[in-house]
């Protein structure tokens, strides 16, 4: 029998290589059973995770999982860093693993992108095939 606890499926030590100036969507995969939990994003500053207020977020619902998305429109150089999503569920706070964004500033990027960037770029093409309903918090 599957657990009805909320689960946040960000992978441990996950990373994204992205370009400044591009749009980007950072997904927090959320599994829940009945009521959708309240989910927030924060950005790590040392050992403290600072809640991100006034940022564009949205939900994407799929059959077995939902995604709470933090929108970067566009990505800025200072978006570099580690992020975590958290869910409030039955008075419990559930925290995800952190995920790290490596932002390459287009102005300072060398002509030939790194192997990591090359590997990441094709994904940026197909993730925009999804359509999301956007809202502001």
């Amino acid at each position: 029998k599957e657990s009805c606890d909320v689960q946040l499926y960000i992978k441990r030590q996950s990373e994204h290589s992205i370009l400044a100036g591009d749009p980007f969507e950072l997904e927090c995969p959320v599994k829940y059973c009945a009521n959708r939990p309240h989910v927030t994003w924060c950005k790590l500053n040392g050992t403290t995770c600072v809640k991100l207020e006034d940022r564009q977020t949205s939900w994407k619902e799929e059959k077995n999982i939902s995604f709470f998305i933090l929108h970067f429109e566009p990505v800025l150089p200072n978006d570099n860093g580690s992020y975590r999503c958290s869910a409030n569920f039955q008075s419990n706070l559930i925290e995800s693993h952190s995920t790290t964004l490596y932002v390459t500033d287009v102005k300072s990027a060398s002509e030939r992108p790194s192997k990591d960037e090359m590997a990441s770029r094709p994904w940026l093409l197909y993730r925009h095939h999804h359509h999301h309903h956007h809202h502001h918090h």
Epitope: Q7, K11, R12, S14, E15, H97, W123
Partner: antibody, heavy 120, light 112 residues
Framework: EVQLQQSGAELVKPGASVELSCTAS????????IYWVKQRPEQGLQWIGR????????KYDPRFQDKATLTAEISSNTAHLQLNSLTSEDTAVYFC?????????????WGQGTSVTVSS | AVVMTQTPLTLSVTIGQPASISCKSS???????????LIWLLQRPGQSPMRLIY???KLDSGVPDRFTGSGSGTDFTLKISRVEAEDLGIYYC?????????FGGGTKLEIK
């Protein structure tokens, strides 16, 4: 049942490149990491790197940064390891390994290995 | 890179007797999330490695309880309470805390 099916043995000439594949069944590769591990004849295990198939992001052991390229195709649930500028030092068995389940993501299931022999 | 040092290199054990393998890491393997990402693998002759233990001491399903893992920080031990014939092979420790991930050099378990 979780399975990682690797492509067949390769005999390649020095200086050439080779691409190995690893097709997963019983799970979606986008939900985990895929690791690649090298084992030279009668020797230990070396971690080459990992790919996150969900976004294509890769991490390499610095020793393999210029030797190996990891890619993945979610549509076919397959990961690939490309090895370039092959020398006799690259003669080895290469394993793909599932990066484990949430929340720990530590390697669990191994493929059967692909033997690569570099010889003229 | 984190160096994983396994001892002994070879272990020759009589069936039914205990065995112990040590794995020492050059850096603490305690992660910021409070978990220690140390696993033990067994590679039987002619086979792929298989995971026996993860997070230092958690036994994988199907692994007999004669295997136990212990340790913390930089010092880890795999113990087999009573060695059986199917236990022969090479045992490896592996750390999943730091990049690059690294393996121990292996310990060959032989049956006397």
């Amino acid at each position: 049942e979780v399975q990682l099916q690797q492509s067949g043995a390769e005999l390649v000439k020095p200086g050439a490149s080779v691409e190995l594949s690893c097709t997963a069944s019983g799970f979606n590769i986008k939900d985990t990491y895929i690791y690649w591990v090298k084992q030279r004849p009668e020797q230990g295990l070396q971690w080459i790197g990992r790919i996150d198939p969900a976004n294509g992001h890769t991490k390499y052991d610095p020793r393999f940064q210029d030797k190996a390229t990891l890619t993945a195709e979610i549509s076919s649930n397959t990961a690939h390891l490309q090895l370039n500028s092959l020398t006799s030092e690259d003669t080895a068995v290469y394993f793909c390994v599932r990066g484990g389940d949430h929340p720990y993501y530590v390697m669990d299931w191994w493929g059967q290995g692909t033997s690569v022999t570099v010889s003229s | 890179a984190v160096v994983m040092t396994q001892t002994p290199l070879t272990l020759s054990v009589t069936i039914g007797q205990p065995a112990s393998i040590s794995c020492k890491s050059s850096q603490n393997l305690l992660d910021s999330d409070g978990k220690t990402y140390l696993i033990w693998l067994l590679q039987r002759p002619g086979q792929s490695p298989m995971r026996l233990i993860y997070l230092v001491s958690k036994l994988d399903s199907g692994v007999p309880d004669r295997f136990t893992g212990s340790g913390s920080g930089t010092d880890f031990t795999l113990k087999i309470s009573r060695v059986e014939a199917e236990d022969l092979g090479i045992y490896y420790c592996w750390q999943g805390t730091h990049f690059p991930r690294t393996f121990g050099g292996g310990t060959k378990l032989e049956i006397k």
